[in-house]
């Protein structure tokens, strides 16, 4: 259950960015679609977007749209949404016209005279805003994701391109490129641009190389960059770590598996608030970290970083953050103490030396000092204690 | 039921103007975004032109555009296109047409048809 953003760090995503310079393509974006390659049509009116009118919709202004896209052609016709039925005349004569309110409501439509973009023009007011949308699914569904990372948020870069997934090279990788990948997926922003072999390497095609991000770019594909052909190998696949990205640690115990409960989330190290910390989320943790399962949770300490985060699981949940959580932004944890625990693979328990981390666990570093891009395009520097 | 008249057709040597008017019965004509389309013999129907409710938005056609422009006054119920640099390609039966849900680009979305005039462009 992903927490909204607080006010200074705004969850952004496609739908905040423009495609295009003014008059250099289509002013038109795709929303609430299974990728950026399909959805609800928006044309860009000034300073908003508006829903693109069904009934002018067409298969010339669809195949406009995916190729504007970079989406490859439009799927076939009776994939679209099909014709919108002509509309009650409205009241006898006689009655109070609605030609201004219809013309303030009127939705606007993309018209166009033949399959390419240039051929086209937004049109406002050219429809009755009767609910009716341009939707449409184009042939190359071009999608983004981070993998082995222990989230959605964190781990090797993957593209979807001609029907498979595949990575991107690490070469000239920063975190501009990160972030246009973070702020894509919906994950913040980028805490972390990583090099090869901080992830499991990836298998399919290398489908970019050399990309290089203004940090401004709606889609990774908006990036400059090569094809991902010759001069790469898994090794270099480059991966990223995301400001909604959660891993945790235990610390101020007698190792790894003991001690006070933190989060890194959001580019800082916060405590967990005790007062809903139960055994199942406990356990959760403790199995999380390769740690066993949870044996004890001692009193917790007054919160000695920023407490703000909340878990509730069932005991099932492979990590804490497939739990139900939420992160409270404005408040610390009100009236209780840090979460702390204490796992059966503790040495304090078992007087062992420390335990290796299981390899079916994967971990990301944070390393003690990342530049953290914010979305105004400054850099701070945090010291991560 | 909307009535849809055109005028204003007729026989016009290439390079020419002609202005074709289409009075409508509706008293709601303000109502309705209005259009023209042609047929040229042996041709099948093709959009010329549309406007919205109150005119403040226009579409043309490729072919017409830069030589045609479409307008309405909605206190005389009218609808004007002004034919400028008339082509032979130009000839044909150009119609009126009325649309209450969208601008009449489409034939689909099309309410109400006029009868249609004649224009021909012809040395």
């Known amino acids: 259950h992903p927490s909204p953003a607080p006010p200074d760090q705004l969850n952004t995503s496609s739908a905040e960015s423009e495609l295009w310079e003014p008059g250099e393509r289509l002013p038109v974006r795709l929303t609430n679609g299974s990728s950026s390659c399909s959805g609800t049509v928006e044309v860009r009116l000034e300073a908003s977007w508006e829903p693109a009118c069904g009934a002018l919709w067409d298969s010339r202004a669809a195949e406009a749209v995916c190729r504007a896209l970079g989406c490859g052609g439009a799927e076939a016709a009776s994939q679209l949404a099909p014709p919108t039925p002509e509309l009650p005349p409205p009241p006898a004569a006689g009655n109070t016209s609605v030609a201004a309110n219809a013309t303030l409501a009127g939705a606007p439509a993309l018209l166009c005279s033949g399959a390419e973009w240039r051929l086209c023009e937004v049109v406002e007011h050219a429809c009755r805003s009767d609910g009716r949308r341009a939707r449409v699914t184009c042939a190359e569904n071009r999608a983004l994701r981070l993998v082995d990372g222990g989230g959605a948020c964190a781990g090797r870069v993957e593209m979807l391109e001609h029907g498979e997934w595949g990575s991107v090279c690490d070469d000239t990788w920063d975190l501009e490129d990160a972030h246009v990948v973070c702020r894509q997926l919906g994950c913040g922003w980028a805490v972390q641009a990583l090099p090869g072999l901080h992830f499991t390497p990836g298998r399919g095609p290398i489908h970019r190389d050399q990309v290089n991000c203004s940090g401004a770019e709606a889609y990774l594909w908006d990036c400059p960059g090569l094809p991902g052909q010759h001069y790469c190998g898994h090794k270099e696949d480059a991966g990223a770590v995301c400001s909604e990205h959660q891993s945790w640690r235990l610390t101020g115990g007698a190792d790894r598996c003991e001690g006070q409960v933190e989060v890194h989330f959001r580019g800082v190290w916060n405590t967990v608030c005790d007062s809903e910390w139960y055994p199942s989320e406990a356990k959760v943790l403790c199995q999380s970290l390769g740690c066993g399962t949870a044996v004890e949770r001692p009193k917790g300490l007054p919160h000695s970083l920023s407490g703000r985060m909340y878990y509730s699981c069932n005991g099932e949940e492979l990590t804490l953050s497939n739990c139900s959580w939420r992160f409270n932004n404005s408040n610390l944890c009100s009236q209780s103490l840090a979460a702390r625990v204490l796992c059966s693979a503790s040495r304090s328990l078992h007087n062992l030396s420390t335990p290796e981390v299981p390899a079916s666990v994967q971990t990301v570093t944070i390393e003690s000092s990342v530049t953290v891009k914010i979305e105004n395009k400054e850099s701070r520097e945090l010291m991560l204690l | 039921q909307v009535q849809l008249v055109e005028s204003g057709g007729g026989l016009v040597q290439p390079g020419g103007s002609l202005r074709l008017s289409c009075s409508a019965s509706e008293r709601t004509f303000s109502d309705y975004a209005m259009g023209w389309f042609r047929q040229a013999p042996g041709k099948e129907r093709e959009f010329v032109s549309a406007?919205?409710?109150?005119?403040?938005?226009?579409y043309y056609a490729d072919s017409v555009k830069g030589r045609f422009t479409i307008s309405r006054d909605n206190s005389k119920n009218t609808l004007y296109l002004q034919m400028n640099s008339l082509r032979a390609e130009d000839t044909a039966v150009y119609y009126c047409?009325?649309?209450?849900?969208?601008?009449?680009?489409?034939?689909?979305?099309?309410?109400?048809w006029g009868q249609g005039t004649l224009v021909t462009v012809s040395s």
């Open positions: 406007i919205n409710w109150v005119g403040g938005s226009t």
């Open positions: 047409v009325a649309s209450w849900g969208a601008m009449p680009v489409l034939t689909h979305v099309i309410n109400y």
